[in-house]
Every structure is written in structure tokens, then in C-alpha cells.
């Protein structure tokens, strides 16, 4: 099926940028692995590179606004022509769920005191308003709560006294449009505005003063431009050469708004000054190699010695990595394929241990299954031997750092009947459902 092809994939937002055009196949679009595509406008953007997991989304809002709840985040397998780690197809979502608490307590409503006395009338003549108030303290609200209703109320009051009202002008109305929009017409362009003696009108009993001055004003229109001339397009120019040597590119034609040139504020030509076409080199673009993550360190050994475990004897170990994905004469991976370091082996060594503090609470598991639970632990942690942190292995080569390697066997005093791990479990509360955010937008 044809797709919309884009020249960029924005990792931070997961959006396609730089529309190249539509009506091409995924295979043609992805001749360049830097490109990206959408199956429909506004749909999910997939990059052309090998699939890998997106960044985790931000945590969704807590499922409740007060007390303890839960919140979800997700990441998506994005890419083309392959699978993410764990044999996961592009487009698949992976979820994480954790406990949250926006506010420890929930708001509680308060109650009103009785109404206070009425204040005096707001005016000394004619009619006004008077007000009375009450306090939100019977009882006071808790944890950001409030009292229902209003803290004050007003009612009309009448002084039984008549006020005299003097006339005052309302603001000038707008100038009427000029009778012509450019110079050289049959009539002298004029504009007029008016105002009313209504802010307020003068009273009759007792009598108020009328407004001073005139209710109308007229003037000549000044600064009018000469009458405008609209622009017109010239012919299309030649098609530009295809700007890329591999994958898809874009060629362009241009035209100029000079047939005639717009004058005296006349409108510019309608439509585009350029138009583009997709050009296809049918040549795949080079793909640079990328290092896989480092493999594990090999066991710590010393040549010609059966075992150096649990001894103050430095050994050596190595780890490797693989350069993957290089195609079509792309760059080789820069840097070393093997890493070597010096080490002391503490593999399966009995060591004195001490109990750690509680770890932070783990994620809720399973994130999308029934009754998710979280846990935290205290571990029996080994105390490492005080061996020299650096050694000089070869004369004249200087000091080298030495790292402890291995999984020792720590010994701690029993804690809550356990010798290695004490675990505390807790259910996750107010768990939201796992829903694909792309489907929610539709």
C-alpha cells in the first residue's frame, strides 16, 4: 500500500518531519534508513531504521487526585523491517505502572457561621445595595476544602431621596469608513463620527445640566494610497536536477510574480512560487555500523593459575561488542571491539555482610494484569576486602586500576528469619487500564 514518506524522524516526540510526498511504497521510502513513513495522515509515524524501543513516555497523571493511586507510562517498538529485543513487532507497546500520591489527604467541606448584620446602604440618594457577610468556620474546611455557597449576599435599598443628574458625553463612536479607498475618485473622501449625551442623560426633576459641545464631527480623509495593482505569475522555470545520490529526493520548479509586479499595495500573486516532484534514484543509501552494547566481562583469571578467587592476586578479564547494521558501503564502527581490565576475583567467596537500607519500591507487576503488586527489599550486602585499588603489572607501564569481579556469598546475622533477602509487598491502588494512546486520539 502507498504511504506518506518523510525525510526525518524526531526521536523526542516520535513525529514525522519534512514531508517528501505520498504515493510511494514503504520499501522505496525506506531505501534511506534516515527517512520515516505514515500509513495515513495523522497516523503513527514509523522510522525506516531497524526497530528499537522508543524512550519511555512521561508518567500519566495519577489515577486519583488525593490519597494513594497509580500511574502508567509506556514505550513503543518503532522502526521498520525487523523486531525489537524480545522478538517484539514494531508498533507494540510495553507498559510500566507505579504508585503515586498527588496529595496525602482529601479535601473536606466546611460549614458557614450565621449571617452578620446588614451594612449601611451604598448610596445617599436614590437606590443602592446593602451587604451582609458570614464566615466559613463552622466548622473550618480541611485539606484545601471550602464551604458551599457565597460568603456574602446583597439586596436593594432605597434612600427615598432623588439625585440630580448632569449630562455627560458617551465616548465618540468610530469614524465611518472613507467614501473612497484610494486617490483619484469622483468624490472628496470624508469620514464622520458621532457621540450621544447618554453617559448619563441630564435629569429633569431635579434638573441636570445638558452636555456641552457638538454631537457630530467630520474631516477629510488623509494619507490614502494610490489605487492598487494586483500581481500576476510569470511562466514556470526549468526543473532542478535530483539533489540526492541515493533514495528519494525532491526536484523543484520556480516562477516569479512579475507579470505584472504588484504595485501600491496590490495583492501578491495567489498560489505557490515553487512546486515539487519526488525523484527516485533507486539506489539504497549507505547505512553506518553501530556498536551493540558491551557483552559481559569474562571471568577474572590469571594465566598459568587454576583459580585466583578469594585471594589478593590481580588477574585480567575482557569483554567484547559487535558492529551491526553496516550496509551499502556505510562507515565502520569507530573504537575498540575488545575491552580489557585488571580485576580481583571474589566469585563465590564467603564475605562478612551487613543489611542494606530498604530499597525504593519497585514497579507494579504485572502492569496490565490482575492485582498488580509492588515490593521492596533489604539485602545482605558483602563488605569487600581491603585489597590495593591499583597495581603495577608490568615494569614502566604505571599503575592500573583493579576492579572487584564476581558474585560473592555474604554472611549476615538473621533478620526476620531471613539470611539474604527481607522483602515487603504491597498492592497497587486505583489502577488505570492500559490503553493504546494512538487509539485514544481517534
Amino acid at each position: 500500500d502507498p504511504v506518506l514518506c518523510f525525510t526525518q524522524y524526531e526521536e523526542s516526540s516520535g513525529k514525522c518531519k519534512g514531508l517528501l510526498g505520498g504515493g510511494v511504497s514503504v520499501e522505496d521510502c525506506c531505501l534511506n534508513t534516515a527517512f520515516a513513513y505514515q500509513k495515513r495522515s495523522g497516523g503513527l509515524c514509523q522510522p525506516c531504521r531497524s526497530p528499537r524501543w522508543s524512550l519511555w513516555s512521561t508518567w500519566a497523571p495519577c489515577s486519583v487526585t488525593c490519597s494513594e493511586g497509580s500511574q502508567l507510562r509506556y514505550r513503543r517498538c518503532v522502526g521498520w523491517n525487523g523486531q525489537c529485543s524480545g522478538k517484539v513487532a514494531p508498533g507494540t507497546l510495553e507498559w510500566q505502572l507505579q504508585a503515586c500520591e498527588d496529595q496525602q489527604c482529601c479535601p473536606e467541606m466546611g460549614g458557614w457561621s450565621g449571617w452578620g448584620p446588614w451594612e449601611p446602604c451604598s448610596v445617599t440618594c436614590s437606590k443602592g445595595t446593602r451587604t451582609r457577610r458570614r464566615a466559613c468556620n463552622h466548622p473550618a474546611p480541611k485539606c484545601g476544602g471550602h464551604c458551599p455557597g457565597q460568603a456574602q449576599e446583597s439586596e436593594a435599598c432605597d434612600t427615598q431621596q432623588v439625585c440630580p443628574t448632569h449630562g455627560a458625553w458617551a465616548t465618540w463612536g468610530p469614524w465611518t469608513p472613507c467614501s473612497a479607498s484610494c486617490h483619484g475618485g469622483p468624490h472628496e473622501p470624508k469620514e464622520t463620527r458621532s457621540r450621544k449625551c447618554s453617559a448619563p442623560e441630564p435629569s429633569q426633576k431635579p434638573p441636570g445640566k445638558p452636555c456641552p459641545g457638538l454631537a457630530y464631527e467630520q474631516r477629510r480623509c488623509t494619507g490614502l494610497p494610490p489605487c492598487p495593482v494586483a500581481g500576476g505569475w510569470g511562466p514556470w522555470g526549468p526543473v532542478s536536477p535530483c539533489p540526492v545520490t541515493c533514495g528519494l529526493g525532491q526536484t523543484m520548479e520556480q516562477r516569479t510574480c512579475n507579470h505584472p509586479v504588484p504595485q501600491h499595495g496590490g495583492p501578491f500573486c495567489a498560489g505557490d512560487a515553487t512546486r515539487t516532484h519526488i525523484c527516485n534514484t533507486a539506489v539504497p543509501c549507505p547505512v553506518d555500523g553501530e556498536w551493540d552494547s558491551w557483552g559481559e566481562w569474562s571471568p577474572c583469571i590469571r594465566r598459568n593459575m587454576k583459580s585466583i578467587s578469594c585471594q589478593e592476586i590481580p588477574g585480567q578479564q575482557s569483554r567484547g561488542r559487535t558492529c551491526r547494521g553496516r550496509k551499502f558501503d556505510g562507515h565502520r564502527c569507530a573504537g575498540q571491539q575488545q575491552d580489557i581490565r585488571h580485576c580481583y576475583s571474589i566469585q563465590h567467596c564467603p564475605l562478612k555482610g551487613s543489611w542494606s537500607e530498604w530499597s525504593t519500591w519497585g514497579l507494579c507487576m504485572p502492569p496490565c494484569g490482575p492485582n498488580p503488586t509492588r515490593a521492596r527489599q533489604r539485602l545482605c550486602t558483602p563488605l569487600l576486602p581491603k585489597y590495593p585499588p591499583t597495581v603495577s603489572m608490568v615494569e614502566g607501564q604505571g599503575e592500573k586500576n583493579v576492579t572487584f569481579w564476581g558474585r560473592p556469598l555474604p554472611r549476615c546475622e538473621e533478620l526476620q528469619g531471613q539470611k539474604l533477602v527481607v522483602e515487603e509487598k504491597r498492592p497497587c491502588l486505583h489502577v488505570p487500564a492500559c490503553k493504546d494512546p494512538e487509539e485514544e486520539e481517534l
Epitope: 559481559e296 539485602l379 569481579w405 558474585r407 560473592p408 539474604l420 533477602v421
Partner: nanobody, 125 residues
Framework: QVQLVESGGGLVQPGGSLRLSCAAS??????IGWFRQAPGKEREGVSC????????YYADSVKDRFTISRDYAKNTVYLQMNSLKPEDTAVYYC????????????????????WGQGTQVTVSG
């Protein structure tokens, strides 16, 4: 002493799937792992999972086919085995690791003990 009980083995055709379960009677261990022993061969590590951070490790021969998972509430560990091959035929054992989970070192390097009785998996056409 933590007791382990494995279940879920059986006879399956090549390309088929099985799900093994290992129920633990306690929780005093750093990691839990699945091992297997074919007739006339040494016991080899298949997959393991750290109790402390949930990180998982797999032998190269089973990567992308086997998945290890855990149910906190039931104190049970599962091994989902897909795309099974005749060379996966063995007795599968569950074991507990009492070696400290030093960062970056696979729990397959652990000190495993407290083995269960094992469950037979046979892959045959």
C-alpha cells in the same frame, strides 16, 4: 530451607510451546534460575531472574525463544518456552542463587542450590 516444586513438562512437537512453573516455599534468595540436564551431559544454565531488580538473563541458545517471569503474589517463577527444538529435550530444574547480585554479572554465574525434583521436557516429531 526453601523448597522448590517444578511442573509443566511434557511431550511436545518441534516448533511447539510449553510453560514450566516453579513454586518456592520461601523467599530467602537473591535470584532464581532454570537449568537443564540432557542425558550424558552436564547441567547447564538456561535463564535466571534477579529478585532485587527483576533483571533477566538468557543462555545464547534460548534467547528470543524462552521468557522468564515472576508472580509476586504466588511466589512462583515461570519459563515460557516457544519454538521448541529437539535439542531442548532435557530434565529442567529450578534452583536458588545465594550469591550477591553484583551489577553487570549475569546470575547464571551465581551459586545455585536448593534444587527442585525436576520436570521432563521431550521435543520429538
Amino acid at each position: 530451607q526453601v523448597q522448590l516444586v517444578e511442573s509443566g513438562g511434557g511431550l511436545v512437537q518441534p516448533g511447539g510451546s510449553l510453560r514450566l512453573s516453579c513454586a518456592a516455599s520461601g523467599s530467602d534468595y537473591y535470584a532464581i534460575g532454570w537449568f537443564r540436564q540432557a542425558p550424558g551431559k552436564e547441567r547447564e544454565g538456561v535463564s535466571c531472574m534477579s529478585r532485587t531488580d527483576g533483571s533477566t538473563y538468557y543462555a545464547d541458545s534460548v534467547k528470543d525463544r524462552f521468557t522468564i517471569s515472576r508472580d509476586y503474589a504466588k511466589n512462583t517463577v515461570y519459563l515460557q518456552m516457544n519454538s521448541l527444538k529437539p535439542e531442548d529435550t532435557a530434565v529442567y530444574y529450578c534452583g536458588l542463587d545465594r550469591s550477591y547480585p553484583t551489577g553487570g554479572i549475569s546470575c547464571l554465574f551465581g551459586d545455585f542450590g536448593s534444587w527442585g525434583q525436576g520436570t521432563q521436557v521431550t521435543v520429538s516429531g
